[in-house]
């Protein structure tokens, strides 16, 4: 296992619709053809996996159908979008990148992106 540098923004504010996008960029030491990207959430010292996708270079990222993540790739950059976020989902979202094939295997973990989420103000009741 060899180390690899991964960069991501330090802090992002999600939209009022609970959507946060950020770029995860990795310094690929070689010509990887198969890459795995995992988003981890760290909150109160606990780390949980949010979503993961494996993709072939030049192809789209494919997350599971029920995943809250979507993404696109371009060269050594992965543009990740996490949706359905609520205030309670505020936390540090860490990008983990693995170069799966061809060998050697490389692993890189970013410092994380602190995502802040605000629950939208409830709409005032309207009389009809």
């Amino acid at each position: 296992c060899k180390a690899m540098h991964v960069a991501q923004p330090a802090v992002v504010l999600a939209s009022s619709r609970g959507i946060a996008s950020f770029v995860c960029e990795y310094a690929s030491p070689g010509k990887a053809t198969e890459v795995r990207v995992t988003v981890l959430r760290q909150a109160d010292s606990q780390v949980t996996e949010v979503c993961a996708a494996t993709y072939m270079m030049g192809n789209e990222l494919t997350f599971l159908d029920d995943s809250i993540c979507t993404g696109t790739s371009s060269g050594n950059q992965v543009n990740l979008t996490i949706q359905g976020l609520r205030a309670m989902d505020t936390g540090l979202y860490i990008c983990k990148v693995e170069l799966m094939y061809p060998p050697p295997y490389y692993l890189g973990i970013g410092n994380g992106t602190q995502i802040y989420v605000i629950d939208p103000e409830p709409c005032p009741d309207s009389d009809f």
Partner: antibody
Framework: QVQLVQSGAEVKKPGASVKVSCKAS????????ISWVRQAPGQGLEWMGW????????NYAQKLQGRVTMTTDTSTSTAYMELRSLRSDDTAVYYC?????????????WGQGTMVTVSS | EIVMTQSPATLSLSPGERATLSCRAS???????LSWYQQKPGQAPRLLIY???TRATGIPARFSGSGSGTDFTLTISSLQPEDFAVYYC?????????FGPGTKVDIK
Amino acid sequence: QVQLVQSGAEVKKPGASVKVSCKASGYTFTSYGISWVRQAPGQGLEWMGWISAYNGNTNYAQKLQGRVTMTTDTSTSTAYMELRSLRSDDTAVYYCARLTGTTSHAFDIWGQGTMVTVSS
Amino acid sequence: EIVMTQSPATLSLSPGERATLSCRASQSVSSSYLSWYQQKPGQAPRLLIYGASTRATGIPARFSGSGSGTDFTLTISSLQPEDFAVYYCQQDYNLPFTFGPGTKVDIK
């Protein structure tokens, strides 16, 4: 070195608007947030809101909602805070501060402050 | 909104004495998101402690922070003349971010 440099002091009449700038240097501007904090004479620190320089999304303190607008110009690494319908109790020193987000979760770099005086 | 309270409002001590400042949050705050700032007259605040207990770059070892949950403490082990100032705690665990009202440390 990493620093935030703010625009100069302003004197405004009640009902007017003020726009304070905060120019960042020495770091990747879009990777961090910019918070605005004000301090009335002899008072404590009041958080006004913040902007995510990465995507331009904003969050404002409830008491200022509708009167304040925070923006960024990523081409010049500058953040702006505009406050409208000024009142005498808006007289304060206005600070911008960098929100780190990851390792320190704090306002690690502060501007020098901009004195805004509202007086008729 | 998380309300931060600080005590005492004023602390009158002599140089060389130990200062203990308290900060309480109205609801639990992850210690990673609790910071302390020092402010001297006519100056911008300066980050002292982040993550409840980690000293910021260039901050002397006489400053230390501790605590978790709702109760946090800033300790200055031996007050130096330049330490007489106002100290604020602040949380950025939840929006809106909030500051405590401050504790003024003045010379006895």
